[in-house]
Amino acid sequence: CPTSCKCSSARIWCTEPSPGIVAFPRLEPNSVDPENITEILIANQKRLEIINEDDVEAYVGLRNLTIVDSGLKFVAYKAFLKNSNLRHINFTRNKLTSLSRRHFRHLDLSDLILTGNPFTCSCDIMWLKTLQETKSSPDTQDLYCLNESSKNMPLANLQIPNCGLPSARLAAPNLTVEEGKSVTLSCSVGGDPLPTLYWDVGNLVSKHMNETSHTQGSLRITNISSDDSGKQISCVAENLVGEDQDSVNLTVHFAPTITFLESPTSDHHWCIPFTVRGNPKPALQWFYNGAILNESKYICTKIHVTNHTEYHGCLQLDNPTHMNNGDYTLMAKNEYGKDERQISAHFMGRPGVDYETNPNYPEVLYEDWTTPTDIGDTTNKSNEIPSTDVADQSNREH
C-alpha cells in the first residue's frame, strides 16, 4: 500500500493528516492490482499539490475519486485520460485556482464537486458556470471565484466579456453514397474565444483526411466502405467554455452479399441459418433443387437480428421429412446487384431405406410454400412445384 495510506483490494484511503502524502498514491509492484481499485479517498493531505499526467492512469477501474481538505493546486490535462469508469469526483476544499473542462470532457461523470476552492474569476472557469446552469437545482453547488479585487463572487453572477459557447455548422450534401465513391463534408465554426475545429468520425473504416483553416474545415472520405453505413460523423467546435457539434449520418448503398449460409440445424424448428448484407434492404428468394421455393406457414424466412445493413435469419422448416432433403439456394437482390449461395440439406433418411447406401430416391416439397418479395415478407404465389409425393401433414404442430 502507498506510504501513509491504507488499502483493501478495491479501495485506497489516505486520510490521516500526519505525516501525510506529498504525491498521489501509487501501489507498489506485486501488491494489489491497481485495475481492481474502484475508490480512492484522500483527505487532510496539505502537501498533496499536484496530480500528474501519469499518477492515476494505472487505476483504470476507478469510479470514485475524492480529494478533500487537501492542498491540490494543479491537475494535469491528461490526468484522467485512461479512467473512463470515473463517475464521481470530489475536490472540495482544496487550492484549485483554475480547472479546465478538458480534464473531464471524455468522462461520463455523475458528480463533480468543487466547492471551497479559490477559483480565479476568468474565462477558464466559465464552463463551470455553464455546467451549473444545465444541472437540475438539487445538484447545484455554491461555487465562488475571486475577482480582481480579491472579493468572493458567486459563479452564477460571473460575466466575462468575449467568453461564450462556440457553434458548429455542417454543410453536408445528401449523405447517401454508393460504396466505393467519395464525399466531402464542410464545416464552419464560430465563437469567442475562437474555437478549435475537429472531426469526430468514431470508428470510420473508410479512408478519410481533413483540412482545417481557422474557422473552416473539410473532411474528405474516399473509397467509401459499406461497413460505414449508419455511422455518425460530427464536426465539433470546442473552446474554454464548452463545445458544440453538428452531425450527419452516413448511408452507404451497396449490392447484397450472403456472408453466411450453413447446413440446417435443429432446435424448436429446423433452421437453415444465413447472414445477408446489403443496402437498400435486399429481397430474398429461396430455390429448392433449382426451382422457386414457395413459402408457407410450414417453411418460411425469419429474420431474427437486424444490424444496420446486416440481416441474420433462418429458412425455418416445421418438421421436415426425407422429402425435404436437397439443395437450397438463397438469392439476395437489390438495385445494386445480387448474390446467391447454395447448401445441401439432409433432414432424414427415407423410411425403410438406408440413405447412406441408397441416396437416389425422389424428394418433394410441401405444396403450399410461397415466395417472399422482401425480407420478412411472405406472400402467397401460384407457381407451386408439382409434387410426386405429398408429405403427410396430419401430425403437424399448428
Partner: antibody, heavy 116, light 106 residues
Framework: EVQLVQSGAEVKKPGESLKISCKGS????????IGWVRQMPGKGLEWMGI????????RYSPSFQGQVTISADKSISTAYLQWSSLKASDTAMYYC?????????WGQGTLVTVSS | QSVLTQPPSVSVSPGQTASITCSGN??????VSWYHQRPGQSPVLVIY???KRPSGIPERFSGSNSGNTATLTISGTQAMDEGDYYC?????????FGTGTKVTVL
C-alpha cells in the same frame, strides 16, 4: 534540530481569558500540522485539535469544539491555544506537538492552573 | 468519535516480553501510533503507522494492527521502559488517544 518551545506556566482565575503559545524551529513550520493535547492531573492524554499553519486549516475534537480556539502566526512560526473564559476544570498540562507520522516532536508542556 | 480501550496496567519481568493492546471499532482500517510517557515528562513517539519505528527508538519496540485490535510489543523489556503507554488513531476528522496503560517492570 527540531524544537517546539511552549510559553511558561500560567495561574488564572475562573472567567479570565488566556492564550498560550508554541514556537517551532528547525523545520518548515508551515508544512506540518501542530496538535494540542491536554493532560489533567493524574489522567491520560486528550487530543484537543490541530492546525495547519500553511493555511490555518483547523480541526477540533468534538469535546473541545467551541471551548478553545487554535490559531497560528506563520510569520513567527508560532501556534496558539486560547480560552475566552477559563473554568476550574481547565486546570491541566497542555502540550503542543508536531504531526509527522504520529506526533514526533513535543513541546515541554504549559501548566495552566485555574483557581479562585 | 471512536473510543480506544487499553488495559489499565501490565506487569512484566525484566528481559521478558510485554504486550499492550488497544481496541477500537475497525481499528485495522486506521493507522495507530504509540507513545511512552514517563512521570513528569512529555510523551515520546515509539511507533507510528501501525509498525514503523522513529529513529532513535530501540528495535525491541514493535507494533501490529488488524481487525479491531492494535498491539504494542516490547521484547526484552528494560527498567527504562516503565511508564504510561498510549495508543492514538485518526478517526474521520479528529485524533483520539487510548485510555492508557501503566507498564510496571517487576
Amino acid at each position: 534540530e527540531v524544537q517546539l518551545v511552549q510559553s511558561g506556566a500560567e495561574v488564572k482565575k475562573p472567567g479570565e481569558s488566556l492564550k498560550i503559545s508554541c514556537k517551532g524551529s528547525g523545520y518548515s513550520f508551515t508544512s506540518y500540522w501542530i496538535g494540542w493535547v491536554r493532560q489533567m492531573p493524574g489522567k491520560g492524554l486528550e487530543w484537543m485539535g490541530i492546525i495547519y499553519p500553511g493555511d490555518s486549516d483547523t480541526r477540533y475534537s468534538p469535546s473541545f469544539q467551541g471551548q478553545v480556539t487554535i490559531s497560528a502566526d506563520k510569520s513567527i512560526s508560532t501556534a496558539y491555544l486560547q480560552w475566552s473564559s477559563l473554568k476550574a476544570s481547565d486546570t491541566a498540562m497542555y502540550y503542543c506537538a508536531r504531526g509527522s507520522g504520529g506526533y514526533d516532536y513535543w513541546g515541554q508542556g504549559t501548566l495552566v492552573t485555574v483557581s479562585s | 468519535q471512536s473510543v480506544l480501550t487499553q488495559p489499565p496496567s501490565v506487569s512484566v519481568s525484566p528481559g521478558q516480553t510485554a504486550s499492550i493492546t488497544c481496541s477500537g471499532n475497525k481499528l485495522g482500517d486506521k493507522f495507530v501510533s504509540w507513545y511512552h510517557q514517563r512521570p513528569g515528562q512529555s510523551p515520546v513517539l515509539v511507533i507510528y503507522e501501525d509498525n514503523k519505528r522513529p529513529s532513535g527508538i530501540p528495535e525491541r519496540f514493535s507494533g501490529s494492527n488488524s481487525g479491531n485490535t492494535a498491539t504494542l510489543t516490547i521484547s526484552g523489556t528494560q527498567a527504562m521502559d516503565e511508564g504510561d503507554y498510549y495508543c492514538q488513531t485518526w478517526d474521520v476528522s479528529s485524533y483520539v488517544f487510548g485510555t492508557g496503560t501503566k507498564v510496571t517492570v517487576l
